[in-house]
């Protein structure tokens, strides 16, 4: 039970310090301070994906 | 199609517990933080708690810590809102939603793009 | 925490309208803000995302601007359909924030 507690403890109580190196379908969000999926930036007069190009989001749909 | 489906609000008296759900479908939940907002009758939104399945980790908003539990199955493809000592105040529509984040130079740069339609929560005796 | 202060709380507005709403973040957040609207019984949409990035599907009528702690969106004119209550939120630092919202009536 315990080291399933520390495991799972509040985001705040972690170090904000450094952002981690993450893999190449990840990107560091900093509001959970870890390594998450993220999808690519889309450049709409090109059509385009790329990592470093911001953009209109590429999405198969609109959100609900 | 990515879809959240909430479920288990109710009415429930104070001091009670109620566990909600958040059913995805669409996309596999270990891959995003997955989020409760709620709302109260005539009022604003208010985050509520976050979990981020692939590892574990949570945060929770200060009216609910020590209250509230977030939770995930990565199995089952759902989040979970377990509320204790529920209070008249949680009264509220409580939404899930999944937070998007696009790769701007190795950072996340996105929002809460996908919410379920909510669930009613009245905590009253 | 860090608080978000959105202003107007209310304001009205006609049809075709350049309607400007502001929020403002008590510490830098850099440009992790979105904008959400929402009508009534519904779900929030997403409309910014990162103060300046569109969604996909949502109309260029709509924009936003800013960084650090002051942010805009713009409704440069507005339609029917855009009566609704705007919500700003920052995701720089958890807990994620959301302004008191604004909402958007016929005059």
């Known amino acids: 039970m315990g080291a399933r507690r520390l495991r799972v403890r509040s985001q705040r109580s972690r170090d904000s310090s450094v952002p981690t190196q993450c893999n190449q379908t990840e990107c560091f969000d900093p509001l959970v301070r870890n390594c998450v999926s993220c999808e690519l930036f889309h450049t709409p007069d090109t059509g385009h994906t790329s990592s470093l190009e911001p953009g209109t989001a590429l999405q198969p749909q609109e959100g609900s | 199609e990515v879809q959240l489906v909430e479920s288990g609000g109710g009415l429930v008296q104070p001091g009670g517990s109620l566990r909600l759900s958040c059913a995805a479908s669409?996309?596999?939940?270990?891959?995003?933080?997955i989020h409760w907002v709620r709302q109260a009758p005539g009022k604003g939104l208010e985050w509520v708690a976050w979990?981020?399945?692939?590892?574990?980790?949570?945060d929770y908003a200060d009216s609910v810590k020590g209250r509230f539990t977030i939770s995930a199955d990565t199995s089952k493809n759902t989040a979970y809102l377990q509320m204790n000592s529920l209070r008249a105040e949680d009264t509220a529509v409580y939404y899930c939603a999944r937070r998007v984040c696009y790769n701007r130079l190795g950072v996340c740069a996105g929002g809460m793009d996908y919410w379920g339609q909510g669930t009613l929560v009245t905590v009253s005796s | 925490d860090i608080q978000m202060t959105q202003s107007p709380s209310s304001l009205s507005a006609s049809v075709g309208d350049r309607v400007t709403i502001t929020c403002r973040a008590s510490q830098d957040v850099s440009t992790a803000v979105a904008w959400y609207q929402q009508k009534p019984g519904k779900a929030p949409k997403l409309l910014i995302y990162?103060?300046?990035f569109l969604y996909s599907g949502v109309p260029s009528r709509f924009s936003g601007s800013g960084s650090g702690t002051d942010f805009t969106l713009t409704i440069s004119s507005l339609q029917p359909e855009d009566f609704a209550t705007y919500y700003c939120q920052q995701s720089q630092i958890s807990p994620p924030t959301f302004g008191q919202g604004t909402k958007v009536e016929i005059k």
């Open positions: 979990v981020l399945p692939s590892v574990g980790f949570t």
């Open positions: 990162s103060a300046s």
């Open positions: 669409g996309f596999t939940i270990s891959a995003s933080s």
